[in-house]
């Protein structure tokens, strides 16, 4: 995915990433020899970011906008090395990886958490959902596990049928080579689909309206 290509444009940075970078620089100036406890530093940054006004955040948002423009500009002229696409091709017709029991639970309870805690960040909502799942009795997890198992079964049938159809250019390659790479390909797909699941969850979090609880 272009990790080794030095010509590949540097990824775009979010306003929060710029803020963290600034925090890091400030910290280095104040304590040049001190080693940084990463989790503690992250926590402090996060707390500071939460208390910052929109005006204060504006500076970093402008930096992020400028960086996004730079990235888009550079990507237009960037040619990936031979044999590599900008992003691994994903067939939109390929069956979607099924959600886990926990993912189904999250879909069910995310609005509740956001309703009860309107100011919560995506990460904190996820943390609360994890805590809630851990506080749920095994019997009560069963319907989610059953549904997830059903969806997994369906996915396995669908993916088998999808693979049986095969990709046109795959037939040209040797059968032995194809068999060898099959396991690796499945692992990659699983990893990729897990990323998708996380991305979707983040998107859902960003899209959902936050409603107050008791009126």
């Amino acid at each position: 995915m272009g990790k080794g290509d030095p010509k590949k444009p540097r990824g775009k940075m979010s306003s929060y990433a710029f803020f963290v970078q600034t925090c890091r620089e400030e910290h280095k100036k104040k304590h040049p020899d001190a080693s940084v406890n990463f989790s503690e530093f992250s926590k402090k940054c996060s707390e500071r970011w939460k208390t910052m006004s929109a005006k204060e955040k504006g500076k970093f948002e402008d930096m992020a906008k400028a960086d996004k423009a730079r990235y888009e500009r550079e990507m237009k002229t960037y040619i990936p090395p031979k044999g590599e696409t900008k992003k691994k091709f994903k067939d939109p017709n390929a069956p979607k990886r099924p959600p886990s029991a926990f993912f189904l639970f999250c879909s069910e309870y995310r609005p509740k958490i956001k309703g009860e805690h309107p100011g919560l960040s995506i990460g904190d909502v996820a943390k609360k959902l994890g805590e809630m799942w851990n506080n749920t009795a095994a019997d009560d997890k069963q319907p989610y596990e059953k549904k997830a198992a059903k969806l997994k079964e369906k996915y396995e049938k669908d993916i088998a049928a999808y693979r049986a159809k095969g990709k046109p250019d795959a037939a040209k390659k040797g059968v032995v080579k194809a068999e060898k790479s099959k396991k690796k390909k499945e692992e990659e797909e699983d990893e990729e689909d897990e990323e998708d699941e996380e991305e979707e969850e983040d998107e859902e979090d960003e899209d959902e309206e936050e409603d107050d609880d008791d009126e």
Partner: antibody, heavy 122, light 108 residues
Framework: EVQLLESGGGLVQPGGSLRLSCAAS????????MFWVRQAPGKGLEWVSR????????YYADSVKGRFTISRDNSKNTLYLQMNSLRAEDTAVYYC???????????????WGQGTMVTVSS | DIQMTQSPGTLSLSPGERATLSCRAS???????LAWYQQKPGQAPRLLIY???TRATGIPDRFSGSGSGTDFTLTISRLEPEDFAVYYC?????????FGQGTKVEIK
Amino acid sequence: EVQLLESGGGLVQPGGSLRLSCAASGFTFSSYDMFWVRQAPGKGLEWVSRISPSGGYTYYADSVKGRFTISRDNSKNTLYLQMNSLRAEDTAVYYCARLRYFDSRGYAFDIWGQGTMVTVSS
Amino acid sequence: DIQMTQSPGTLSLSPGERATLSCRASQSVRSSYLAWYQQKPGQAPRLLIYGASTRATGIPDRFSGSGSGTDFTLTISRLEPEDFAVYYCQQYGTSRWTFGQGTKVEIK
């Protein structure tokens, strides 16, 4: 004001059916698990059924499984209990209750309706 | 299923006295899964304590909960006239939400 108001109770013959309703107000109904809990005359409390916020997941006590169906209409802020094949032992006051999750301190029924009486008798 | 046994069945006390209500589970219950409710005649139950020891909103501090594992206690430090009622403990350990049979606190 946060409120739950049950209706639909009454006298029914054994083997008959009844549909209870619970109207919710003052809170975001679609964010909560809802329960039906019953209390036979002079007896203790017994949970009957539970439904998840979207209505996609339901749970029943063994004593009512296969006879009762819990459902909800989030657009109407209403919870339902369809009771079929009623028996004399189903005679009770039926309460709807909201399940509240108190972070790591667990779960409890924090809001209850006033109850509706169901009498199964010939 | 986890059975909840409350004792005593009835507690006869005078206003101003201390009430100690016991609730025993047939097997260990997580503290976060134990709650106490108060019910007066003709009324719906009211949540008093959740997570074994946390008072619900609006509950006076004369009510306190304690305990862990299989033994839990509800204490009313000084009984007020409005405290005479039936008290139920309730656990959530499986999808069975079981209640104790109740303890009636009556005026002596």
